[in-house]
Each structure stands twice: as structure tokens, then as C-alpha cells.
């Protein structure tokens, strides 16, 4: 805590400008009016304050807004955001996507910090659901964002938002998350034709049930092995050799290279040897 001292004569700040970088911590505390700082927050980012000086500025804002900063201030925090704790952020009410973007920009290129995670959580909870624009923004900054959400949190994602999801956004999703996302994707893409539908749904198939895989096997989709390996084991086991052959098309030869890995190993084990032999791959059940 900075001690309260009178501002030296002639040093009272009339605006936030570069002259303040020469102020000592106690001078900043004494000579910068918190209300002035709040109205000119956008200027702070253009001034090379030290981390210690930023601490003083944060302290002044905390005193002015003990219940949490207004969005007009939050939007212009810039790199002062890096000084905020998750506890500070929990007091905020962020509703503008522009504010969210501005703060994410500050942290760009870094791992998702606890501060950013809290900010996103507050924003999404404030909106009530993860809409398409928000999802677009979040996955642009953090491709793994979607897979960082619990299945419960993912349940609030409306099917319309699924259009914003790119294949790489699902790279780190586990089976439970794909179980939630797949039905939403199926709904979102339901009006597309066969080949276009498969291109869109492919990344989500780790959550697909057996009956959907059987349906896909009738559509000449030629699923690649990488996608097949991500399918749910319980969805793959009931598939017949003929259905897997149709599902994979020319990629069926890849089963040989994966015969010791799940779910291929589990599937092979449960097939009749006569049926496996029809593939001509030397697979042993």
C-alpha cells in the first residue's frame, strides 16, 4: 500500500501523458486523480510505465471502483490487465465482445492464464451461452479453447455456433467432450449434401454412435484411418467387416498398420476370421 502524501506543488496531473513516467510511486499516488485516470485509460498503454508504476495506477482504480471496474474502463485496460488477479476479474461485468477482444489481444501468443480463463468464464456466463461470434473470437486466440471446457459447459453451446469450429479446435478434445459436441454438429450440418456433410462432420465423429457410422458406410465417404482411430470403441465394435470396408473405402488397407492399436484391435478381436479374411490383409482375430 502506498502511503498518503500531499502532491508537490505544480505536479498535479492534468492529463495522463508521458511526463508521468518520471514520477515516483508516491508522486503518482498523490498527484494522479483516479477519476482522471479512469477517463483517460486509453492513454496508459501508449506510455512505458514500469510494473511498479502500473501497480500504483491499479491501486487507484481499485480505490475508485471497489465493487469492480465499469466496462468503459475495462475495455481500455490494455497491458494493465496483466496486473489483474482472477479475484479482481470476478467483480467485473463484461458484456461487449470488443472488450473481450481487446483484453485477449494483450495476452496474445501466451498460454491461457488464470486471468484470461476467469475473464472468458465471466463473459460467457454473462451472455448465457457460447454464441457463434464469441466462439469465433475465442478459438481464434486459443485454438484449444473448446476442449478446455467441461462436457457440462459444452452443453450450453448452441448448434449454430458449431459452424465456427475448425478441425484443429477439436484436436485436444476427449471422448466425453465429443459426445456432447457431435449431436450439435449433426444438427448444425443436417441440411448439407452427403460429401459436404462428411467434410464438416468428420472432426466430430469421435462422438458418433454406431447407427450413424453404419449410415455413413452407405455413402461412399472413404473415411481416413486417422478419423477411424478416433471413433468411440463402443460405436466401432458392432460394425461388420463389410460395413468397415465400405466406411474406409480405399483406406481399409490401413487397418493392417493399426491392428495392435485401439479401437482396431478390439474390433478385429470380435470379428469372425472368415470375414476378416475377405479383406485380404492378413488380420488375425
Amino acid at each position: 500500500e502506498v502511503e498518503k502524501t500531499a502532491c508537490p506543488s505544480g505536479k498535479k496531473a492534468r492529463e495522463i501523458d508521458e511526463s508521468l513516467i518520471f514520477y515516483k510511486k508516491w508522486e503518482l499516488e498523490a498527484c494522479v486523480d483516479a477519476a482522471l485516470l479512469a477517463t483517460q485509460m486509453d492513454r496508459v498503454n501508449a506510455i512505458p510505465f514500469t510494473y511498479e508504476q502500473l501497480d500504483v495506477l491499479k491501486h487507484k482504480l481499485d480505490e475508485l471502483y471497489p465493487q469492480g471496474y465499469p466496462e468503459s474502463v475495462i475495455q481500455h485496460l490494455g497491458y494493465l490487465f496483466l496486473k489483474m488477479s482472477p479475484e479482481d476479474i470476478r467483480k467485473w461485468n463484461v458484456t461487449s465482445l470488443e472488450t473481450l477482444k481487446a483484453l485477449l489481444e494483450v495476452n496474445k501468443g501466451h498460454e491461457m492464464s488464470p486471468q484470461v480463463a476467469t475473464l472468458i468464464d465471466r463473459f460467457v456466463k454473462g451472455r448465457g451461452q457460447l454464441d457463434k461470434d464469441t466462439l469465433d473470437t475465442l478459438t481464434a486466440f486459443y485454438p484449444g479453447y473448446l476442449c478446455s471446457l467441461s462436457p457440462e459447459e459444452l452443453s450450453s453451446v448452441p448448434p449454430s455456433s458449431i459452424w465456427a469450429v475448425r478441425p484443429q479446435d477439436l484436436d485436444t478434445c476427449d471422448p466425453r467432450q465429443l459426445d456432447v459436441l457431435y449431436p450439435k454438429a449433426r444438427l448444425a450440418f443436417q441440411n448439407m449434401n452427403g460429401s459436404e456433410y462428411f467434410v464438416k462432420i468428420q472432426s466430430f465423429l469421435g462422438g458418433a454412435p454406431t447407427e450413424d457410422l453404419k449410415a455413413l458406410s452407405q455413402q461412399n465417404v472413404s473415411m481416413d484411418l486417422a478419423t477411424f482411430m478416433k471413433l468411440r470403441t463402443d460405436a466401432v465394435l458392432p460394425l461388420t467387416v463389410a460395413e468397415v470396408q465400405k466406411l474406409l473405402g480405399p483406406h481399409v488397407e490401413g487397418l493392417k498398420a493399426e491392428e495392435r492399436h485401439r479401437p482396431v484391435r478390439d474390433w478385429i478381436l470380435r470379428q469372425r476370421q472368415d470375414d476378416l479374411d475377405t479383406l485380404g490383409l492378413g488380420l488375425q482375430g
Epitope: 476427449d174 466425453r176 478416433k230 463402443d234 478381436l269
Partner: antibody, heavy 119, light 107 residues
Framework: QVQLQESGPGLVKPSETLSLTCTVS??????????WSWIRQPPGKGLEWIGY???????NYNPSLKSRVTISVDTSKNQFSLKLSSVTAADTAVYYC???????????WGQGTMVTVSS | DIQMTQSPSSLSASVGDRVTITCRAS??????LNWYQQKPGKAPKLLIY???SLQSGVPSRFSGSGSGTDFTLTISSLQPEDFATYYC?????????FGGGTKVEIK
């Protein structure tokens, strides 16, 4: 409630064959979803998977033990068995049988049986 | 074969502590990772399967995360009955390898 129970001699001489049987009760060894494994744990050491069998008779063994291991299944008795040949002192361990449910893991284990290899 | 490396090999903690154990696979195993708890003289018990799914009957203070090669078992608030040895295991590859174990002891 499926339960597993290991049985067999607790002492085996070096160079002989270790034989153990696991009896499955409260369920069927012929289950579509399950494979049946043997796992061992030398005193004070970690777990080592030995191999599994499916009710069809298909087996899969740990490559490091493959040349000495045979696992068989008797569906009529609801049992599966382990034979480990040419044993040495290094094979002294607690031997567990376990069910591997295809959608999870080794979810049911026997209580284990200690086998000592010594002359 | 896929090697599984657990760390630390042992740790001391107090009741109420948050405990994290990591497991690393020598190659990608997708989400095929299980965690077991073993107490002295007892058979291991399945805690977590498929990296993050809680086995029926296991307290919710246990959680798992990770995919690919890096996985974590977390005990959010250690209880007296949690002092045991924990093993990770991969069922992805047919070699079914276990990690070396992590012994959680009382501080």
C-alpha cells in the same frame, strides 16, 4: 457382481512351469465386451501385464514374455489359465487375474496369489 | 512398445492438499489412459479410464486430464484413505504397459 479368484501352487521350482487358474463367478467368461488378463507384481515393484485371452481363444501376450507364456480359456468351467514356462527367481511375484472391460480398463481384479520360484 | 513414465516416483502430502501426478507416454496414445490406486497387500483399483472418465463408485475428488502423450491425475483434496501407490496404464497399444507408480505418503 463379477468376482475373480486365482488358484494354483504358491511354490514353483526353477526351470519348471508355473500354472495358475482364474475362476470367474457372477458373470461369463464368454462376454462380448471383455478380455481376461494376467498381471503380475514382483515384491516391492510395479505392475507388469502378462497377456490376455478372449473367449474365442484369441490371445495377446507381452512381447517380453511371449516365448514362455500360454493363456487358455475353458468356457464350460468359466475359467481361464496361465502357464509360464522355464521360470526363474525373477518370476517370483503376486499374480493377479483381471477383467479388461473394453470401454474402461481392468475394472475387476482377483485378490492375487503369491508365487515364489525357489528350489 | 510404448513406454509410460510417471512422475514423481513418490511424494509427501498432507490431508487436504491438492495432489497432481503426471504420466507421459513415449508416443501418442490418444485418450487411452487409465489410472489405478493400489494399497499395500491389495489388488489395484481402477479410478479413471479414457484419460478423464471417473469409474463408478470413485469419489469426485479424483480427476484425470490429458490426451496424446501427457496426462495428469489430480486429487483435489487428499483424504486419509488416499495414501497409496498410483499407476497409469495405456490400453491403446497391445503391449498394455503400466507406469512405474507414484507412492503418495503422509507428510
Amino acid at each position: 457382481q463379477v468376482q475373480l479368484q486365482e488358484s494354483g501352487p504358491g511354490l514353483v521350482k526353477p526351470s519348471e512351469t508355473l500354472s495358475l487358474t482364474c475362476t470367474v463367478s457372477g458373470g461369463s467368461v464368454s462376454s462380448f465386451t471383455d478380455t481376461w488378463s494376467w498381471i503380475r507384481q514382483p515384491p516391492g515393484k510395479g505392475l507388469e501385464w502378462i497377456g490376455y485371452i478372449y473367449y474365442s481363444g484369441s490371445t495377446n501376450y507381452n512381447p517380453s514374455l511371449k516365448s514362455r507364456v500360454t493363456i487358455s480359456v475353458d468356457t464350460s468351467k468359466n475359467q481361464f489359465s496361465l502357464k509360464l514356462s522355464s521360470v526363474t527367481a525373477a518370476d517370483t511375484a503376486v499374480y493377479y487375474c483381471a477383467r479388461d472391460f473394453v470401454l474402461s480398463g481392468f475394472d475387476i481384479w482377483g485378490q492375487g496369489t503369491m508365487v515364489t520360484v525357489s528350489s | 512398445d510404448i513406454q509410460m513414465t510417471q512422475s514423481p516416483s513418490s511424494l509427501s502430502a498432507s490431508v487436504g492438499d491438492r495432489v497432481t501426478i503426471t504420466c507421459r507416454a513415449s508416443q501418442s496414445i490418444s485418450s487411452y489412459l487409465n489410472w489405478y490406486q493400489q494399497k499395500p497387500g491389495k489388488a489395484p483399483k481402477l479410478l479413471i479410464y479414457a484419460a478423464s472418465s471417473l469409474q463408478s463408485g470413485v469419489p469426485s475428488r479424483f480427476s484425470g486430464s490429458g490426451s496424446g502423450t501427457d496426462f495428469t491425475l489430480t486429487i483435489s483434496s487428499l483424504q486419509p484413505e488416499d495414501f497409496a501407490t498410483y499407476y497409469c496404464q495405456q490400453p491403446y497399444d497391445a503391449s498394455y504397459t503400466f507406469g512405474g507408480g507414484t507412492k503418495v505418503e503422509i507428510k
